[in-house]
Amino acid sequence: KSSNEATNITPKHNMKAFLDELKAENIKKFLYNFTQIPHLAGTEQNFQLAKQIQSQWKEFGLDSVELAHYDVLLSYPNKTHPNYISIINEDGNEIFNTSLFEPPPPGYENVSDIVPPFSAFSPQGMPEGDLVYVNYARTEDFFKLERDMKINCSGKIVIARYGKVFRGNKVKNAQLAGAKGVILYSDPADYFAPGVKSYPDGWNLPGGGVQRGNILNLNGAGDPLTPGYPANEYAYRRGIAEAVGLPSIPVHPIGYYDAQKLLEKMGGSAPPDSSWRGSLKVPYNVGPGFTGNFSTQKVKMHIHSTNEVTRIYNVIGTLRGAVEPDRYVILGGHRDSWVFGGIDPQSGAAVVHEIVRSFGTLKKEGWRPRRTILFASWDAEEFGLLGSTEWAEENSRLLQERGVAYINADSSIEGNYTLRVDCTPLMYSLVHNLTKELKSPDEGFEGKSLYESWTKKSPSPEFSGMPRISKLGSGNDFEVFFQRLGIASGRARYTKNWETNKFSGYPLYHSVYETYELVEKFYDPMFKYHLTVAQVRGGMVFELANSIVLPFDCRDYAVVLRKYADKIYSISMKHPQEMKTYSVSFDSLFSAVKNFTEIASKFSERLQDFDKSNPIVLRMMNDQLMFLERAFIDPLGLPDRPFYRHVIYAPSSHNKYAGESFPGIYDALFDIESKVDPSKAWGEVKRQIYVAAFTVQAAAETLSEVA
């Protein structure tokens, strides 16, 4: 058979035909359609959108499109008993209350079912007490407060600014510090870019704008009541007291107008340094409590949200592969939004929709991919990646045997400066080669490749002439596929200039002002960045599903493994005396990485030389590539995080959004100088080095000649 057995068009023409079919105007139209009303997880509106997408994907030509439903724990404000925060005087009278809703944007004044700002999964409670300002509520912020400033947060309500780390980590840190409540706010220093107007006149956050979001610490568990298993109709559910990852103290988010009112009265200690000061006209005093004149006033939280088991719906579309139907390439992104979802997620969902339409067009012309492509519209991502995780739990046996790759498709844009890619090292070469073939949409790069503009604007800090590609962390739907199942994964979107815009995320993230108009007026009027992201995501899926030999380069894993080994070793070497005392050696890890490198090199040579017309040998080599990511999975998982099983990468224990390399060793070394039993602590470091070395060696052996 020819190498082109899956199609009636030449392979080069296929990719071109697929890319040429993608149209910016369609993405624009789909975005508009998806953003006219809220699509909150668990609501009727989001169920209707699921059915609409199911119907349209069928029309586009997919072989089958099914809804997969689960009954999971969600969280909603009480409609008749709103959440708010007060300043109370010594008599208990409320002398200031935070706003109950965001002022709706122009044109949306009459839209119903806009959920007011809340912290999803906050327990109910009405704590009152003195305020302590804890900066970003990062691990290092609490170290500064407790160890250096000797400020005790126990029994206090803490106020933390959004940004830098995942909000769930902030809440966990506050709980561990003994706080009895958390107020989260958006500081203009992080959510108001200088020289840009507030929405609706620009893309900055107005003072009444508030970031919603969940505050769970699930560590990959999915539905809090059914960890490890799908929340189906015969599921056994834990009691709420045993649920995974729920916060134990009330939490509520506010905008910077309201934050000003709380922070301007703060007394106690001055901020330790300028990094603790935001951009409000307040002293940023740490507290505890208010200054002199206001010292008898307290802060009181009123939180009445409820946790409810609610039905959610994923849409799963299938385009059957012609040659290897039992090999799955998955493109997935979520559909649920906090409000209108102008960027998150619908800028991604619109791109997925157009990718499905393009693949469907090719299929109607008689083409099929070599491998099966699965398309997914996930539900309840905003509530803890629930839809994707439950589906993966339900289908884990199929996925671990058949899953080739997962490409994530949440927000297509978080800026309009350059490309941003996070992926497994196996995909580095795929991404490089693809972006060299795509045109850059950037001003000043007309006629140049996307690779060129990306490399110029976002150069790799380590490798000359290469663009930056980051580690996968979490906070999105690839988590279960990569961190739990070990399926090669990647994500791509257009981003801001991190050099000049140091605010966190994009200013209107998870606010009511994330509308279609935000995108159409300010971010991407021509939808050229959306189109580029569609080309990157779609192009990756196309290559992964259609190339004869999987487009994975195991040599790139070898390079990063050595880099990560050097990094973790240098962290450990900050304690040379203890390393001597406890006989801590990284030699086993260094040796395993070198073995991996040599075996990967030999495998790559065989990959270039083998007879690709022999289907058995081809399948054998492709299986070795497909299962390499799987080989980095430790079935026992990481300490206290059983669903994070990848030994090379995990979400940082201090920031779910960030990826950490050799996380087991990293966590064992973290703050080791403060451990009460150094012998035990260094013993755990040694154990983690052993686990890492064994895993790398075992992974290397999967690439060895089979006999």
């Epitope: 580095y428 070469s429 490089h432 380590e462 490798f463 000359s464 002439g465 290469m466 040599r555 790139d556 070898a558 390079v559 050595r562 080994a565 050097d566 070793y569 240098s570 070497m573 040379p576 990284f586 030699d587 890890l589 260094f590 040796s591 070198k594 490198t597 040599e598 090199s601 040579e605």
Partner: antibody, heavy 122, light 111 residues
Framework: EVQLVESGGGLVKPGGSLRLSCAAS????????MNWVRQAPGKGLEWVSS????????YYADSVKGRFTISRDSAKNSLYLQMNSLRAEDTAVYYC???????????????WGQGTTVTVSS | QSVLTQPPSVSGAPGQRVTISCTGS?????????VHWYQQVPGTVPKLLIY???NRPSGVPDRFSGSKSGTSASLAITGLQAEDETVYYC???????????FGGGTKLTVL
């Protein structure tokens, strides 16, 4: 016979440019990391730059970063070093050297060219 | 000032055994990076003598041997001969510099 032959050296003024070439034969050039190493008169060996087999991983010594560019053409079995903004301290014999594998940080350099002399002087 | 430290010179009588040391740090030899040794006769091209700490390329006499322990490595030459009188370099990789590093070279004199 495994062989590396450098060319392109010469006398150049400070601030000037030169392009060195290295022709490889007798081995599968496309499978190995390649390097440039230099030796100033009466001094020791100094690594300058490395490039891996598919030109994706490129590294430079701090002393030449931003001024020198390494490249290769596997179809022509050739390695290049474009040297810009040359300084007097770049005066040296420049050797092209093959790494024993595709990872410059692990392996020794088993094949060396005869060297080409670069003199930077006004 | 080289990252890898070698003695500027060593000497020995014909037939004797000499060792040349190469001292690194926790970022190169101590970080699991191998050491390689080269011989360079003045006016000629460097020649690989020992690779991966202790391996000899074909054609190198077994009088030459290498070893590495921790942050130090050494090249031993037994049965010293007149033609061994030349310069020897050690080489490794330094992760803090992200680059290949050479020792300053050691001149061996056969007395």
């Amino acid at each position: 016979e495994v062989q590396l032959v450098e060319s392109g050296g010469g006398l150049v003024k400070p601030g000037g440019s030169l392009r060195l070439s290295c022709a490889a034969s007798g081995f599968t050039f496309s499978r190995y990391n390649m390097n440039w190493v230099r030796q100033a008169p009466g001094k020791g060996l100094e690594w300058v730059s490395s490039i891996n087999s598919n030109s994706r991983y490129i590294y430079y010594a701090d002393s030449v970063k931003g001024r020198f560019t390494i490249s290769r053409d596997s179809a022509k079995n050739s390695l290049y070093l474009q040297m810009n903004s040359l300084r007097a301290e770049d005066t040296a014999v420049y050797y092209c050297a093959k790494t024993m594998g595709d990872y410059y940080y692990y392996y020794g350099m088993d094949v060396w060219g005869q060297g080409t002399t670069v003199t930077v002087s006004s | 000032q080289s990252v890898l430290t070698q003695p500027p010179s060593v000497s020995g009588a014909p037939g004797q055994r000499v060792t040349i040391s190469c001292t690194g740090s926790s970022f190169n030899l101590g970080a699991g990076y191998d050491v390689h040794w080269y011989q360079q006769v003045p006016g000629t091209v460097p020649k690989l003598l020992i690779y991966d700490n202790s391996n000899r390329p074909s054609g190198v006499p077994d009088r030459f041997s290498g070893s590495k322990s921790g942050t130090s490595a050494s090249l031993a030459i037994t049965g010293l001969q007149a033609e061994d009188e030349t310069v020897y370099y050690c080489q490794s990789y330094d992760s803090s510099l992200s680059g290949v590093v050479f020792g300053g070279g050691t001149k061996l004199t056969v007395l």
